[in-house]
């Protein structure tokens, strides 16, 4: 057992790039307060365990108002310490969630209203007993610098809080075997209480007679290591011959979550998913009503009246989580169309589009020849994203601005002589040979394979290309 | 006629504070950010900051954070208070508005990440 | 922050003529890129964003195009109101969550 100690230095704007405004006014003065939320273990927080090491609320900060035309100062907080007992074993990694809360005490129907200002979430290591651990994190435009701690209550004691110390027999010196208790000197270790030969480097225990072993290890003293080749059986303990996993008691037989919970393994113990109303470790806290302001990130609590009725929170947007604890990460829902980059910006959305694509999010399909003229009679052809003109002849270029040779290509058939004109090429035909391109034989009787000639020309006069 | 309005610029001595005003009319001030943009003779636009109208978010460029502070002072008008003013900030300080996109069952408002109406701007002179 | 590198800085056309200006981003903007062009003693004016959507009103003799990190503006037909100084901008988002914008230099266009 033992107290997880949150001591909150500052609250203020941060060096981000915006600067917040006062959270107070003087139409609406306020004070802040901060919530903290411990779970055990460094995974990813599960939306359903809400603060299963414990929670806690902090008294109430002095009343602010906003100088008129003052950026945002660092705000006056509330005076003390944030503790959250522990009743079992002090698990070394936790994630933390903390809140800061603005309390406006101005003229609101039905008492003050409460609205959160930042959130910050973590996850770190940490041994029971060591020095206060400084801390630095930011939430949007604000920063927040705290420090914590774990410490054992006595008479437990270790980076666990899992030895126990009792007073020494005698004044000098411990019993055989036994180390003085650090920090208290006047103190002894007490025997050991865990199962008789468990492994003091893999195993731990939090009741007497117990053995529980660290990840990687099995067996009833946990001195076998697990052996990754492939068993028959999910859990140990093992066999010591093999190393692999015999069936045996898990750390959820007989499911040790109160109060309808349901129990999960975990590499050093197990884990309670508690139901609405009820949390801690094996689910036994329970009473918690909406007075106690179990919804975060400015959820709405409903019900919850009297610690017998349970609570249901109902999430602001961008929040889920029975205690609407988890940020949606808004991104996941793909809003960004066409295969866009999306960018959480906090206060927005903001869609990065891919090539042929355009609009707040990437919904328009570029016409690609919208807005961009192909000079010179050129027509527009779409394509990926790109647009390409197809040049009317005498020009060329990506736009048609630049002037070709028509003759380049000798498209003058049959020996014709080809010609440069203003608007694209003409075609001397050789003796013969008639059209366009000079493409159409003269039949010898006179007949040409043309159906007729235009008025004016004859066989063998020049043919303008249009 | 969409519109934007700055007002409150002039000769100031060095190290002191000043607020310019931008009052916008025409359209609705929800839905989009107002911003500040400053241009210093011969020189090329240089963003401040901006104010998300929704809901108050501010933010602004690194160097701005501490001197500049954008506010939004009304529905149709947002200030941006300078302090410890030199010569360096001399410039013309333009009020520019960055819309934002919104969408019926969509998670958030989508930013548009450029300016697509400017005011006439006001010259800010700092000297001795 | 990002950097928007433009070239060149001032450049020369005759009247009809084609102009065109280049804009560097110093990282992938996708298609996150507008136009302004700028004339002495106006605030500038939007021509262009998402890298080729022209805003309504403007001509098309103006064109753009680009994608990632180089992008490019084209002015054909020259006439003497296209005189002016046209900058390139885009929005960042950075990873320590900072959200702004950021100009080129600017290229000055002088029509003969």
């Known amino acids: 057992a033992g107290v997880f100690e949150l001591q909150i230095h500052s609250f203020g704007p941060g060096p981000g790039p915006g600067a917040p405004r006062s959270p107070c006014s003087a139409r609406l003065p306020c004070r802040l307060f901060f919530r903290v939320c411990l779970k055990p273990g460094l995974s990813e927080e599960a939306a359903e365990s809400p603060c299963a090491l414990g929670a806690a609320l902090s008294a109430r900060g002095p009343v602010y108002t906003e100088q008129p035309g003052a950026p945002a100062p660092d705000l006056p907080l509330p005076d003390g310490l944030l503790q959250v007992p522990f009743r079992d074993a002090w698990p070394g990694t936790f994630s933390f969630i903390i809140e800061t809360w603005r309390e406006e005490l101005g003229d609101q129907i039905g008492g003050p209203a409460w609205s959160l200002l930042a959130r910050v979430a973590g996850r770190r290591r940490l041994a029971a007993g060591g020095p206060w651990a400084r801390d630095i994190q930011r939430a949007g435009a604000w920063e927040l610098r705290f420090s914590y701690r774990a410490r054992c209550e006595p008479p437990a004691v270790g980076t666990a809080c899992t030895r126990l110390c009792r007073p020494r027999s005698a004044p000098s010196r411990c019993g055989p075997g036994l180390r003085p208790c650090a920090p208290l000197e006047d103190e002894c270790e007490a025997p050991l209480v865990c199962r008789a030969g468990c492994s003091p480097e893999h195993g731990f225990c939090e009741q007497p007679g117990e053995c529980r072993c660290l990840e990687g290890w099995t067996g009833p003293l946990c001195t076998v290591p697990v052996s990754t080749s492939s068993c028959l059986s999910p859990r140990g303990p093992s066999s010591a011959t093999t190393g692999c996993l015999v069936p045996g008691p898990g750390p959820c037989d007989g499911n040790p979550c109160a109060n309808g919970g349901s129990c999960s393994e975990t590499p050093r113990s197990f884990e309670c998913t508690c139901p609405r109303g009820f949390y801690g470790l094996r689910c036994e806290v329970s009473g918690v009503t909406c007075a106690d302001g179990p919804c975060f990130n400015g959820g709405l609590c409903v019900g919850g009246a009297d610690p017998d009725s349970a609570y249901i929170c109902h999430c602001p947007p961008g929040f889920q989580g029975s205690n609407c604890e988890k940020r949606v990460d808004r991104c996941s829902l793909q809003p960004c169309r066409n295969g866009g980059l999306c960018l959480d910006l906090g206060h927005a959305l903001r869609c990065r589009c891919r090539a042929g694509f355009a609009g707040p999010r990437c919904e328009h399909d570029l016409d690609d020849c919208a807005g961009r003229a192909c000079a010179n009679g050129g027509t527009c052809v779409e394509g990926g994203g790109a647009h390409r003109c197809s040049c009317a002849l005498g020009f060329g270029g990506r736009d048609c601005r630049e002037r070709a040779d028509p003759c380049a290509a000798r498209p003058c058939a049959h020996g014709g002589r080809c010609y440069a004109h203003f608007s694209g090429l003409v075609c001397a035909c050789a003796p013969g040979y008639m059209g366009a391109r000079c493409e159409f034989p003269v039949h010898p009787d006179g007949a040409s394979a043309l159906p007729a000639a235009p008025p004016g020309l004859r066989p063998g006069d020049p043919q303008r290309y249009l | 006629q969409e519109q934007l309005v700055e007002s409150g610029g002039g000769l100031v001595q060095p190290g002191a504070s000043l607020t310019l005003t931008c009052k916008a009319s025409?359209?609705?001030?929800?839905?989009?950010?107002m911003c500040w943009v400053r241009q210093a003779p011969g020189k090329g636009p240089e963003w401040i900051a901006c104010?998300?109208?929704?809901?108050?978010?501010a933010y602004s460029a690194s160097w701005a954070k501490g001197r500049f502070t954008v506010s939004k002072t009304s529905s149709t008008a947002v200030t941006l208070q300078v302090t410890g003013l030199t010569a360096a900030d001399t410039a013309t300080y333009f009020c520019?508005?960055?819309?934002?996109?919104?969408?019926?069952?969509?998670?958030?408002?989508?930013?548009?990440?450029?300016?697509?109406?400017w005011g006439p701007g006001t010259l800010v002179t700092v000297s001795s | 922050d990002i950097v928007m590198t433009q070239t060149p800085a001032s450049v020369e056309a005759a009247v009809g003529g084609t102009v065109t200006i280049k804009c560097q981003a110093s990282?992938?903007?996708?298609?996150?890129l507008a136009w302004y062009q700028q004339k002495p003693g106006q605030p500038p004016k939007l021509l262009m964003h998402?890298?080729?959507v022209l805003t309504s009103g403007v001509p098309s003799r103006f064109s753009g195009s680009g994608y990632g990190t180089e992008f490019t503006l084209t002015i054909s037909d020259l006439e003497c109101a296209d005189a002016a100084t046209y900058y390139c901008?885009?929005?960042?988002?950075?990873?320590?969550?900072?959200?702004?914008?950021?100009f080129g230099g600017g290229t000055e266009v002088v029509v003969k």
């Open positions: 520019a508005r960055s819309p934002y996109y919104t969408y019926g069952g969509a998670p958030s408002a989508y930013a548009s990440g450029y300016f697509n109406l």
């Open positions: 025409g359209f609705d001030f929800t839905s989009n950010a």
């Open positions: 104010i998300y109208n929704d809901d108050g978010s």
């Open positions: 990282e992938n903007i996708y298609n996150s």
């Open positions: 998402d890298a080729s």
């Open positions: 901008q885009s929005d960042y988002y950075s990873t320590g969550g900072s959200y702004g914008f950021a």
